[in-house]
């Protein structure tokens, strides 16, 4: 299970796997749950040791058996990878008061605070963490210095006291990156610029993960199985060069290039690979043999394990062993496999235990219905009922859920509410007449509205709604990814509009979740309908030229959802219109990209 | 690659004035805090002055030199110049430019070659 | 004022000697130590930065120590091309930018 205590004044002896610099323990317990191998980590803070060279040292471990024997050792800090638990991150926004980290300096420059100069960091695509000395730093030519810095492993190679100086990570993995996202994989495309590593994948999108959690890697190759060198096969190579652009395309068949999705790896998995691959066999270090039904079972096994990384499975010979196949769960030193064969007859997959190092957004849900305009349930698993109890309870809008403890819908929905008392927030509802007394809902603890919101036509029209208690993620309610910054270039064409509200100008609340597939439409062309309107960047368009499908009243707040690359995003919140469905009137929406940084400004507040 | 070039050395009378020169190329010179450093003959290095990139009103000088040398510079023409008023004997010495560079901490990575100064009557 | 105090100030050594010069400072200057090569009529060049990170183009039998103080230069294998005067300077608390007296190193 998971396991959060951290142990004080103790060190874990033996099972080193690794070691390297952090600044605290918490940010070493970080690094444990991400590392393929780690379960046990212990710390040593400056205060407990002499030797500089141990100072700040985050020695990672594992242990057959879960467990390692705990010796005494004063000031030291010890604990468990937070593998085994739910909403684990990556986001560490800490910053680090009189610390230096060091590592190869590439770039300094004049800042006029910390928070510049992490911007400037999360916003280059080399920089893995900075120092910036203070204005009260005592060398005159070094004061407001903003140093970005990068290593190999993307952690210290030393850190040190120094006073007036702070020290902090790359934001890139909070989301709040402004670097492009290129999401897609180029065909029969070669890059030729220097590998920092190379791993062994069963395809290009597994590859792609692979290098977007590499802290190195800003592109890769990817060499297929039909690739003419049989030593090459399944071969990804995980690349970076100077310019952070690969200097060389060559055009090669069977090969596949891509780039690190670091900057939007929060609306895509990373970690979690869950496909399987037919006719083909994963080797490493065997972990266990166990009989298994099928290969969806041998994933099972292989996830309920917690030092399984991948598996495969055999599939039983007529009549033998009651039908059970062979599950081989196996490990590696880097997760990945040592050899990938194919030929054999064997199912490969991964755990599915890194899922959760994912944000939750990425699942993949049930498959849309076609046609008709009623959803069905587990359709839409974001899009909530927020209901008033004054002067009686009705559906007032819609909402999305955006984190375990958040919903993000339009500002103009809560004019004239007074409290967030009476306000309740249904999630998991198909049918509004599902809600009687007795089911259960989502009080809300506090109303968050853009404070530069006026009405709903000038823009701004955003707020979130923080609950009092937390939601557990299911098949009907889970949170839809926001879209990353560095997507604001994606073309989406696979957008909806869902909500309960009217279907025609003049009508009522529908019972039935309704769904409607809807084209964006450029600013350009919007502003060319609102003429007495400005349509600004913050905004977003979505209707048929010839009217007839739209978001009407009753979907304010509402998602418009567009599916890109398999996962889902809030591109808008319904906002305004001119009628409903009218001819050459689009449905306006706030566009949530634009909001992103104060999304999470007000959901990540300490 | 990086040169500086100083220039406008000579000899000069006790209590007069001269203007060095520092012509920069090969790097972008306004990013960059340029200093002066001297060296008497036969003795150590001593710095003079320094001129920030980042702030005009940022020039800061050697206790020996203030209200005496002004450290200028023109971004538009890649020059850096001292202007030395009130010269004595004492400030004879072989005088640098030199370019500063965050290395971690800062460095003087490149200077010139030298000009010298004499004062004398 | 930070003051930098080099010793010795001149030595005398054989080409192949591995040479050591040390450098003190008045107060802490935790790692801001950089040392410089100076030949006769020539721009002092820098050598070695933040204490111990070699600039580049310079050779690695050049090699330098310390934090806080202490710091030392060495040169493992001493060649011809050596035999100049050593400086030290401190950059963490300025101005003013202050230089050791300079070691001068000689052919024995």
């Known amino acids: 299970g998971c396991l959060t205590q951290l142990y004080e004044n103790a060190f874990f002896r033996g099972g080193d796997v690794a070691s390297m610099y952090t600044p605290n323990a918490q940010y070493c317990q970080m690094r444990c749950t991400f590392h393929p191998r780690c379960l046990l980590f212990s710390f040593l803070p400056a205060s407990s040791i002499n030797d500089m060279e141990k100072r700040f040292g985050c020695f990672l471990k594992d242990s057959v058996t879960g467990t390692l024997p705990k010796v005494h050792r004063t000031g030291a800090v010890s604990g468990h990878s937070l593998k085994q638990c739910h909403q684990i991150s990556a986001c560490n926004k800490d910053i680090y008061v009189d610390l230096d980290m060091k590592g190869i300096n590439y770039n300094s420059s004049v800042a006029k605070s910390a928070q510049e100069c992490q911007e400037r960091c999360t916003d280059d695509v080399h920089c893995h963490f900075f120092t910036y000395a203070t204005r009260q730093f005592p060398s005159l030519e070094h004061r407001n210095i903003c140093l970005l810095k990068h290593t190999q492993t993307g952690t210290p190679t030393r850190i040190t006291k120094l006073d007036k100086v702070v020290s902090g990570f790359s934001l890139k993995s909070c989301a709040l990156s402004n670097l492009a996202c290129i999401r897609d994989i180029f065909p029969n495309t070669v890059f030729a610029d220097s590998n920092i590593d190379s791993v062994m994948a069963p395809d290009a999108f597994v590859c792609g993960r692979i290098c977007t959690h590499h802290p190195g890697c800003l592109f890769f190759t990817f060499f297929s199985q039909e690739w003419p060198k049989e030593s090459q096969r399944n071969l990804c190579l995980l690349k970076t060069s100077e310019s952070g652009l690969p200097s060389t395309r060559i055009k090669k068949s069977k090969a596949l290039s891509g780039f690190s999705l670091q900057s939007c790896r929060h609306s895509i998995p990373v970690f979690c690979h869950s496909s399987f691959y037919h006719d083909t066999d994963f080797l490493g270090e065997e972990l266990d043999i166990v009989a298994a039904k099928s290969h969806e079972a041998c994933q099972k096994l292989c996830t309920n394990a917690v030092r399984c990384q991948f598996f495969t499975y055999t599939p039983a010979q007529a009549s033998c062993n009651e039908g059970k196949g062979k599950c081989y769960l196996k490990l590696s030193s880097n997760g990945s496999p040592t050899k990938i064969l194919h030929g054999r007859g064997g199912i490969s997959g991964y755990t599915l235990r890194l899922c959760k190092m994912d944000n939750e957004c990425t699942t993949k849900i049930k498959p849309r219905i076609v046609g008709g305009t009623a959803s069905v349930r587990g359709e839409w698993p974001w899009q909530v009922t927020l209901h008033t109890t004054s002067p009686t309870q009705r559906h007032l809008c819609g909402g999305s859920i955006i984190g375990n403890q958040w919903i993000l819908t339009a500002a103009h929905c809560f004019y004239g509410v007074e409290s967030p008392k009476i306000l309740r927030v249904y999630s998991g509802i198909l049918n509004q007449s599902e809600i009687k007394e007795d089911t259960s809902f989502f009080g809300v603890q506090e109303i968050i509205i853009h404070d530069q919101y006026k009405m709903a036509e000038s823009g701004y029209d955003i707020a979130l709604l923080k609950l009092e208690t937390t939601v557990n993620y299911t098949d009907s309610q889970r949170p839809i990814c926001l879209p990353s910054k560095g997507d604001r270039n994606v073309i989406y064409t696979d957008c909806w509009v869902t909500g309960w509200g009217y279907r025609k100008l003049r009508d009522k609340i529908q019972n039935t979740l309704q769904k409607a597939k809807i084209p964006l439409v450029t600013n350009e062309e919007c502003q060319k309908r609102y003429r007495g309107h400005k349509i600004t960047h913050k905004m977003i368009c979505a209707g048929y030229r010839e009217g007839g499908k739209d978001a009407c009243k009753g979907d304010s707040g509402g998602p418009l959802s567009c599916k890109h690359n398999e996962v889902w995003h809030l591109v808008g919140i319904t906002s305004w219109g001119e009628g409903c469905a009218q001819r050459e009137r689009p449905g306006v929406y706030t566009n949530v990209v634009e909001y992103v940084d104060w999304i999470l400004e007000k959901t990540q507040a300490v | 690659q990086v040169q500086l070039v100083e220039s406008g050395g000579g000899v000069v009378q006790p209590g007069r004035s001269l203007r060095l020169s520092c012509a920069a190329s090969?790097?972008?010179?306004?990013?960059?805090?340029m200093h002066w450093v001297r060296q008497a003959p036969g003795k150590g290095l001593e710095w003079v002055a320094i001129?920030?990139?980042?702030?005009?009103?940022?020039?800061y000088y050697a206790d020996s030199v203030k209200g005496r040398f002004t450290i200028s510079r023109d971004n538009s023409r890649d020059m850096l110049y001292l202007q030395m008023n009130s010269l004595r004997a004492e400030d004879t010495a072989v005088y640098y430019c030199?370019?500063?560079?965050?290395?971690?901490?800062?460095?003087?990575?490149?200077w010139g070659q030298g000009t010298l100064v004499t004062v004398s009557s | 004022d930070i003051q930098m105090t080099q010793s010795p100030s001149s030595l005398s050594a054989s080409v192949g000697d591995r040479v050591t010069i040390t450098c003190r400072a008045s107060?802490?200057?935790?790692?801001?130590l950089n040392w410089y090569q100076q030949k006769p009529g020539k721009a002092p060049k820098l050598l070695i930065y933040?204490?111990?990170s070699l600039q580049s183009g310079v050779p690695s039998r050049f090699s330098g120590s310390g934090s806080g103080t202490d710091f030392t230069l060495t040169i493992s294998s001493l060649q011809p091309e050596d035999f100049a005067t050593y400086y030290c300077?401190?950059?963490?608390?300025?101005?003013?930018?202050?230089f050791g007296q300079g070691t001068r190193l000689e052919i024995k």
């Open positions: 933040a204490a111990s």
């Open positions: 001129f920030l990139s980042y702030d005009g009103s940022n020039k």
């Open positions: 030199a370019k500063s560079e965050i290395l971690v901490v800062p460095t003087l990575d490149y």
């Open positions: 107060q802490s200057i935790s790692s801001y």
């Open positions: 300077q401190q950059s963490y608390s300025t101005p003013p930018i202050t």
């Open positions: 090969g790097f972008t010179f306004s990013s960059y805090n």
